[in-house]
């Protein structure tokens, strides 16, 4: 998985004689918004083949009202880049369409009118993860420089994105024949040679065609926990060294779609089922017709002459999704729950919980207090709909399991001294403070101003 | 015992709209996505849709999309089937069918058939 | 969609025959397949998940084999209660497609 992203720098007049002074007609201003479909291959494809690899639309750009007599501007664009997600690997020969619109906004009958301005067909090759591409492409009469590359998402890396990283077994090194893997120094590079299906999690290999389980996990593709209750609580982001790798927090915390998307976890990125009449990566792109072209993967627009009425996308087979975006795959049905991810192994579905969920479909909630141990005397303490463990003096961590110096908290105020003690802490307070945690100030007449019953 | 049960046989008008129920039993409703097959007199098997019980989302064959609506009661443990505008080509027999939400297994179990008969 | 071609459409055979149907999908699609038996007026019963998986309570004379995009279904002693329409289906991809049935028919 990974983000193809493609940045517009200037749109206008080519150098030659009679080249056109404004994208705008003479009935007044006009903006400009841009098209990108990216198709798999280096074949001539028909110019209606549909953007297989995916396609994005830019938000519209500001006005621009042609001056008589003046120079001819820079053009005005839209703002930021153009972001094509890809689910698969990237295949590193593709076509290249960038189609410039303009939307005159005069006094058009039934509100804005949209035409295609330029069109321009590239094949190219391109490595995922190197460096932005810049190209100059001329349309007619028009002029489009613009930059271009494919970045993996991570735990993808490599030329195709289809290596995996992972944690490093040890601090100091990766595996025999492993290099780091940029830019993550940290990690290591997964051997891309384990069983078909082996967990990328749980499992790991030193051997072709091996799949061997880390602690607490097992079956021949590493992905049958021995036992929950040894995970419970060891669910931060990093809980490796115990085997369970329960991943933290997940990319659809906080939920990135705008305009009333929904957030579903993709292998790591995240995927907006947008709302009719909004697309882009986060639902972003509004007041889309059909004249813009929002149905991909040859879908049939109907309706929407006008941003304010809606248009509706006829899917062809096997594809679905307000923009007809999103392929229909046997993980479409959303089987895991609770935000978990849908692994399709070939000869079954499978479920990558997120943290504080377990179960085949991610169904059980560790994280409550029926299930959740509280060790060294802690109590486990519910509200919010969160649940944590309340520890003991001289405990602490997410179970109360680690010692924790009562101290540690600079717990005495106004300076008072604090001393570990076998029944928990003693502050010994300042001249002038009194009180359990030296909190009350002493009054020269010996009165402390301690708070009203 | 897993069972499905299905409602009764349905005579009906051109035009008119037919609502087919499959009542689960015996498992856990929402573990299980449920399928839909048509047989028309003397034919074939033919996949209609499918729906996963626990969230709603429903996935349909392109020849069943638009007059056909799929849709659960959770409650009751119990999937329907609703076809609108009906045709005479709608006659035939209406199964559910349950498989496994992780498609470890196939179509398992099966609800005895309902016979929708179209005719004026 | 994917195309389920199953030979033979009919067959005929007596009982303790050994009978075999096949199953082609139009690509490969990796043992997400089953078997089905459906008699006269009755609903259809699974036989054979994942192209080789008995299905609870099914007798050990029905047996599933193959790869790719070729499966077969051996009954290895047809027995009378045996004889039916049978149909081999596809869940590799949506949408699921059967394929056109057998008639198993008395010798």
């Known amino acids: 998985a990974g983000v193809f992203e493609l940045q517009i720098h200037s749109f206008g007049p080519g150098p030659g004689p009679g080249a056109p002074r404004s994208p705008c007609s003479a009935r007044g201003p006009c903006r400009l918004f841009f098209r990108v479909c990216l198709k798999p291959g280096l074949s001539e494809e028909a110019a209606e083949s549909p953007c297989a690899l995916g396609a994005a639309l830019s938000a519209r750009g500001p006005v621009y009202t042609e001056q008589p007599e003046a120079p001819a501007p820079d053009l005005p664009l839209p703002n930021g880049l153009l972001q094509v997600p890809f689910r698969d690997a990237w295949p590193g020969t593709f076509s290249l369409i960038i189609e410039t619109w303009r939307e005159e906004l005069g006094d058009q009958i039934g509100g804005p009118a949209w035409s295609l301005l330029a069109r321009v067909t590239r094949r190219r090759r391109l490595a995922a993860g190197g460096p932005w591409a810049r190209d100059i492409q001329r349309a007619g009469a028009w002029e489009l420089r613009f930059s271009y590359r494919a970045r993996c998402e991570l735990p993808a890396v490599g030329t195709a994105c289809t290596r995996l990283c992972r944690p490093r077994s040890a601090p100091s090194r990766c595996g025999p024949g492993l290099r780091p893997c940029a830019p993550l120094e940290d990690e290591c590079e997964a051997p891309p040679v384990c069983r078909a299906g082996c967990s990328l999690e749980h499992g790991f290999c030193e051997q072709p065609g091996e799949c061997r389980c880390l602690e607490g996990w097992t079956g021949p593709l590493c992905m049958v926990p021995v036992s929950t209750s040894s995970c419970l609580g060891l669910r931060g982001p990093s809980s490796t060294t115990t085997g369970c790798l329960v991943p933290g927090p997940g990319p659809c915390d906080g939920n990135p779609c705008a305009n009333g998307g929904s957030c579903s976890e993709t292998p790591g990125s995240f995927e907006c089922t947008c709302p009719r009449g909004f697309y882009g990566l986060r639902c972003e792109v509004s007041g889309v017709t059909c004249a813009d072209g929002p149905c991909f993967n040859g879908g049939l627009c109907v309706g929407g002459a006008d941003p304010d009425s809606a248009y509706i996308c006829h899917c062809p087979p096997g594809f679905q999704g307000s923009n007809c975006e999103k392929r229909v795959d046997r993980c479409s049905l959303q089987p895991c729950r609770n935000g978990g991810l849908c692994l399709d192994l070939g000869h079954a579905l499978r479920c990558r919980c997120r943290a504080g969920f377990a179960g085949p479909r991610c169904e059980h909630d560790l994280d409550d207090c029926a299930g959740r141990a509280c060790a060294n005397g802690g109590t486990c303490v519910e509200g919010g709909g969160a649940h944590r463990c309340s520890c003991a003096l001289g405990f602490g961590g997410r179970n109360c399991r680690e010692r924790a110096d009562p101290c540690a908290a600079r717990p005495c105020a106004h300076g008072g001294r604090c001393y570990a003690h076998f029944s928990g802490l003693v502050c010994a307070c300042a001249p002038g403070y009194m009180g359990a945690r030296c909190e009350f100030p002493v009054h020269p007449d010996g009165v402390s101003a301690l708070p009203a019953a | 015992e897993v069972q499905l049960v299905q409602s009764g046989s349905e005579l009906k008008k051109p035009g008119a709209s037919v609502k087919v129920s499959c009542k689960a039993s015996g498992y856990t409703f929402t573990d299980y996505y449920m399928n839909w097959v048509r047989q028309a007199p003397g034919q074939g098997l033919e996949w209609m849709g499918i729906?996963?019980?626990?969230?709603?989302?429903?996935i349909y064959n392109h020849k069943f999309k638009g007059r056909f609506a799929l849709s659960v009661d959770k409650s009751s443990n119990t999937a329907y089937l609703q076809i609108s505008s009906l045709k005479a080509e709608d006659t035939a027999v209406y199964y559910c069918?349950?498989?496994?939400?992780?498609?470890?297994?196939?179509?398992?179990?099966w609800g005895q058939g309902t016979t929708v008969t179209v005719s004026s | 969609d994917i195309q389920m071609t199953q030979s033979p459409s009919s067959l005929s055979a007596s009982v303790g025959d050994r009978v075999t149907i096949t199953c082609h999908a139009s690509?490969?699609?990796?043992?997400?397949m089953g078997w089905l038996q459906q008699k006269p007026g009755k609903a259809p019963k699974g036989l054979i998940y994942h192209g080789a998986n008995l299905e609870d309570g099914v007798p050990s004379r029905f047996s599933g084999s193959g790869s790719g995009a070729d499966y077969t279904l051996t009954i290895s002693s047809l027995q009378p209660e045996d004889f039916a329409d049978y149909y081999c289906v596809q869940y590799a991809q949506f949408p699921y497609t059967f394929g056109g049935g057998t008639k198993v028919e008395i010798k």
């Open positions: 690509q490969g699609i990796s043992g997400n």
């Open positions: 069918a349950r498989q496994d939400s992780l498609l470890d297994y196939a179509m398992d179990y």
């Open positions: 729906i996963n019980p626990y969230s709603g989302v429903t």
